[in-house]
């Protein structure tokens, strides 16, 4: 193609003139969040023995953390791009209340917890731009989220530590599944 007037031919193809594609940006954003989660998990595991605990079921009763299932169309068998994208966005929106809970749960990684929360908001925006069927995405009810947050914060210390551990573990698994699925799109 001819070079537009006033542009150097060497620069037209130069990557520093081309922003990342939507897919590259989403991929990097997810890996950025996963990196932050791994830093937060390190603090959680160092601080308590939650990462080796077998009593997870006790705390899981209080939680309704998003999980990928066959019907969501994100696995290789029965892969469905649109259904899967809706699930990923819906799941991330549902995780937001749990990410809010994580704020103030960390001493040395407070900034990192904030970065994970903020990066997730940005990821949701990127994915919403990619989705064709935004009507299918259900946004969590703010009142329900507020009472869930109050309930989680009222738990005893042990349950709060366990909840923190479970949120991080589930969010990591959800993001890893999302990353694999998005790389197929």
């Amino acid at each position: 193609a001819p070079v537009p007037p006033g542009e150097d031919s060497k620069d037209v193809a130069a990557p520093h003139r081309q922003p990342l594609t939507s897919s590259e940006r989403i991929d990097k954003q997810i890996r950025y969040i996963l990196d932050g989660i791994s830093a937060l998990r390190k603090e959680t595991c160092n601080k308590s023995n939650m990462c080796e605990s077998s009593k997870e079921a006790l705390a899981e009763n209080n939680l309704n953390l998003p999980k990928m299932a066959e019907k969501d169309g994100c696995f290789q068998s029965g892969f469905n791009e649109e259904t899967c994208l809706v699930k990923i966005i819906t799941g991330l929106l549902e995780f937001e209340v749990y990410l809010e809970y994580l704020q103030n749960r960390f001493e040395s990684s407070e900034e990192q917890a904030r970065a994970v929360q903020m990066s997730t908001k940005v990821l949701i925006q990127f994915l919403q731009k990619k989705a064709k069927n935004l009507d299918a995405i259900t946004t969590p009810d703010p009142t329900t989220n507020a009472s869930l947050l109050t309930k989680l914060q009222a738990q005893n210390q042990w349950l709060q530590d366990m909840t923190t551990h479970l949120i991080l573990r589930s969010f990591k698994e959800f993001l890893q599944s999302s990353l694999r699925a998005l790389r197929q799109m």
Epitope: R31, D35, M118, V122
Partner: nanobody, 116 residues
Amino acid sequence: QVQLVESAGGLVQPGGSLRLSCAASGIIFSINAMGWYRQAPGKRRELVADIMPYGSTEYADSVKGRFTISRDNAKNTVYLQMNSLKPEDTAVYYCHSYDPRGDDYWGQGTQVTVSS
């Protein structure tokens, strides 16, 4: 004003090694993902390697086991150690920074040529 300044590339023999460095200014380096992309003539840009703030790394399949990315937050610098270089590694290598809001910046690029 964001600046990413790459070290000079060069001509290397097949099987040889080269270390690229990229010094960043104008960004909060410690919270940025840093990476290297490359583009060979007539080919699409590809991610070579990147490193996240807490050290998670990603490599292109074609460079795994040969290239190593690392960062020094105190020096605001990211490195790419390239070993066992092959003629197909010939390209312009670009330093890249990415922050959690999704903003990204590029260096001007440095030519790496692998040839005997």
